[in-house]
């Protein structure tokens, strides 16, 4: 096989030009060597027609040239004013005959076609770059190149070689000749915008002598794709402008009749309805980017526009992409609370629906930031650690078959409220948007832990009790342990229950859990709370501390807590111990990709390991009158 | 977005024919060059085909290892490009990928180098039998 590369094939009309680019190896020798161009006859034998050397054949005089491109190791071959004669076998080839190196090229050329004035028809999106291809004959080569508009009858002109460039086309308009080729101009319009649609005539010379080019340019608005989503759930917009718009700011509008709203933008800007609700991620260098619209209303319906331009707005002759939305409102996502209150010190816990046909899914729970584009930092999951700043107050509980999950957050400040999202590594659209408002709050918890201070010693049995208002009488009290895989229920014992509910005396309602004797595992985070079924309630948190017995301190069993150990049976403790490898975080890469801006809680995973045995639970039981 | 979606490949017995097309869709792109490159198993990309215009110039080009065997055309329209297969050989196996090119490029450019395309479909598998 010929190292040399060519064209197989090149096909043109008459009157027209071709340049024939052959490529060979890069060697000094092949960069210094005789480049030639031969057309093969009938005996075998190949004419040269025109050759690096200087050679240049009767046939082809005036209407060819060869240029050597030692840098790029090629070299091209110019034909102009082709006549059906021009059809036939050739070779491009190196060496000092016509036999060395070479490469077959042929040659067709046809009549041209019946309608001289061939108009060329240009299809372009707005605010993308036409680029019109202007022929002429050698005879026009050194004269005045121009591109005018057709308006009725006259021909504006829109730029020309002498560097006149219409007001309406300024800095959008060029003319340029490229590489070797000396019987076509170009010319570039960018940011087109819907005006610039039309019919233009280029020009090379005057008078009857002057070669023309007839070119259509139709500038198309974006085609929008529809996309059908459910009340409720989310919607990803992806952006692909392209690499010429890749250092520009980015936006996303929803059209009007005249005008397009800024929803967001890269430069900070966004619209108050969608707070809480929506994301921009960079996807690339290359100017790609999404946005994330989650709890999908009604009034989300609508033409949605994406762009790109420095001022971070909509502007005319710029790329734009663009989508109609539908919103379904017969949706499979359940409605739930959009808005969650609580107070300081106080508790919340919020219901987050997921598909039901996909209880085995990871579920996590993250906390919607404004900065920059917005982000989801998780700050809990199924298998992901909690992170750091919400230990001890926040935990995810998950009710397998039932279609939603619970999460709990206690000791509430004010700096807790914002949005929240529930979301799954399952079907992206059941992602739910919550508002969480934590006010001051005007009176005491419902919920109170006796003793306030608690430090339980080694060896030693510690109760703690838990104060409740008559309101949760008929709700199911719990204790329960925390630790980063969620707040295991322990056994407790519900003093109030024996109680008439008629009765009911709001100073002795106390669900009280013992730990004897105590561990050293057992510091930690402890729970109450108050549920029904699968329905959490309110919690509060109290932290245990563990230290060791003081020595020369007497072991002191109070009698009345063995007495109360008599009245109350034992209740079976429940296990638990926690596994090292369960309390890693490994959250699914199915969750996030499509949305790297949900950042994952998981990389602390290393320092935040819970400790192989979390809680002592068989020494912990209810003994409580 | 541009997209190149690939079609007729298939299962070939050794010598006989096999017709691939290549269609480009998008926001009206408009090509001006289109190729077919392959890729068999823990080889490199490969070049096998190529069509460029300009105008009413059409420009054709083909590898080494196909040539007199494989020829490139396009559609009037400029957006579907086909690579007509004959005398098919078990070392034809592998995947095809079509490539595009919207702007053109430097005169320069060598077609053969798959860096210089801008645009990539999915490719097609071709097997030959033996």
């Known amino acids: 096989q010929s190292p040399i590369f060519g064209p197989q094939d090149v096909s043109s009309i008459e009157g027209n030009s071709v340049s024939i680019t052959c490529y060979y190896p890069d060697t000094s020798v092949n960069r210094h060597t005789r480049k030639y161009w031969c057309r093969q006859g009938a005996n075998g034998y190949c004419a040269t027609l025109i050759s690096s050397n200087g050679y240049l054949s009767k046939e082809y005089s005036g209407r060819a040239s060869l240029i050597n491109f030692p840098e790029n190791s090629t070299f091209v071959i110019n034909i102009a004013h082709l006549t059906q004669e021009d059809t036939g076998s050739y070779k491009c080839g190196l060496g000092t005959t016509n036999r060395g190196l070479f490469f077959d090229v042929s040659l067709e050329v046809s009549q041209v076609p019946e309608f001289p004035n061939d108009t060329h028809v240009y299809t372009k999106d707005i605010g993308r770059t036409v680029t019109i291809e202007c022929r002429f004959k050698e005879g026009n080569a050194h004269s005045k190149k121009s591109l005018c508009k057709k308006r009725g009858e006259a021909c504006e002109v829109v730029i020309d070689s002498t560097e006149y460039v219409d007001p309406s086309y300024k800095d959008r308009a060029i003319l340029f000749m490229k590489g070797t080729s000396r019987d076509i101009f170009y010319v570039n319009i960018s940011h087109l915008i819907p005006s610039d649609a039309g019919l233009y005539v280029c020009q090379a010379g005057e008078g009857p002598s002057a070669d023309k080019n007839n070119a259509d340019l139709q500038v198309l608005e974006p085609e929008p794709e529809l996309l059908y989503k459910d009340l409720r759930s989310s919607v990803t917009f992806e952006c692909d402008l392209g690499r010429e718009v890749a250092n520009d700011a980015k936006y996303l509008c929803r059209k009007n009749k005249e005008t397009c709203d800024v929803i967001i933008n890269t430069l900070g800007k966004r619209d108050p309805a969608f707070e809480g609700r929506i994301l921009l991620t960079p996807r690339d260098d290359n100017g790609r980017f999404s946005v994330l619209i989650t709890g999908l209303r009604k009034e989300d319906a609508g033409h949605y526009q994406c762009g790109a331009h420095s001022s971070g707005l909509p502007q005319e002759g710029w790329p734009v992409q663009a989508w109609q939305l539908f919103v379904n409102e017969e949706s499979t996502i359940p409605n739930s609370r959009s808005v969650v209150k609580g107070v300081t010190g106080g508790s919340v816990a919020i219901v987050c629906p997921y598909n039901p046909k996909e209880s085995s899914s990871l579920k996590y729970w993250c906390h919607w930031e404004a900065d920059e584009n917005g982000r989801c930092p998780v700050l809990v999951g199924t298998q992901a650690l909690v992170q750091e700043g919400y230990e001890g107050r926040l935990a995810l509980f998950d009710q397998p078959g039932s279609g939603a999950y619970t999460v709990i957050l206690n000791q509430l400040t004010t700096q807790d409220s914002g949005f929240y999202w529930c979301l799954t590594d399952g079907d992206s659209r059941w992602r739910t948007t919550i508002e969480l408002q934590v006010a001051e709050a005007t009176k005491k918890p419902d919920l109170e832990v006796t003793p306030q201070n608690a430090t339980a010693v080694i060896g030693e049995t510690f109760t703690i009790s838990c104060h409740y208002p008559c309101k949760f009488y008929s709700q199911e009290k719990y204790w329960c342990k925390w630790s980063n895989d969620g707040c295991h229920i322990l056994p407790s014992h519900d003093e109030g229950a024996r109680q008439s509910s008629v009765s009911c005396d709001q100073s002795s309602q106390i669900v009280s859990m013992t730990l004897n004797p105590v561990k050293k595992e057992d510091e930690g985070w402890y729970w109450c709370g108050v549920k029904e079924g699968q329905v959490y309630g309110e919690t509060t948190a109290i932290y245990v501390a563990v230290e060791e017995r003081t020595r020369g301190s007497p072991h002191i069993n109070p009698t009345d807590a063995n007495a109360r150990a008599k009245d109350a049976p034992e209740e079976e403790a429940m296990e638990s111990s926690v596994r090292e490898d369960e309390n890693k975080a490994n959250l699914d890469p199915r969750l996030f990709a499509d949305e790297r801006e949900i950042q994952n809680a998981g990389d602390q995973a290393q320092e935040n390991r819970a400790s192989g045995n979390a809680g002592s639970a068989g020494g912990q039981s209810g003994s409580s009158k | 977005q541009v997209q190149l979606v690939e079609s007729g490949g298939g299962l070939v017995q050794t010598g006989g024919s096999l017709r691939l097309s290549c269609a480009a869709s998008?926001?009206?792109?408009?090509?001006?060059?289109m190729g077919w490159f392959r890729q068999a198993p823990g080889k490199e990309r490969e070049f096998v085909a190529a069509?460029?215009?300009?105008?009413?110039?059409?420009?054709?080009y083909v590898g080494d290892s196909v040539q007199g065997r494989f020829t490139i055309s396009r559609d009037a329209a400029g957006n579907t490009v086909y690579l007509q297969m004959n005398s098919v050989k078990p070392e034809d196996t592998a995947v095809y990928y079509c490539?595009?090119?919207?702007?053109?490029?430097?005169?320069?450019?060598?077609?053969?180098?798959?860096?210089?395309?801008?645009?990539w479909g999915k490719g097609t598998l071709v097997t030959v039998s033996s």
């Open positions: 998008g926001r009206t792109f408009s090509p001006y060059a």
């Open positions: 490539a595009a090119d919207r702007v053109p490029k430097d005169i320069s450019i060598d077609p053969r180098n798959p860096k210089d395309w801008d645009y």
């Open positions: 069509i460029r215009w300009s105008g009413a110039t059409t420009y054709k």
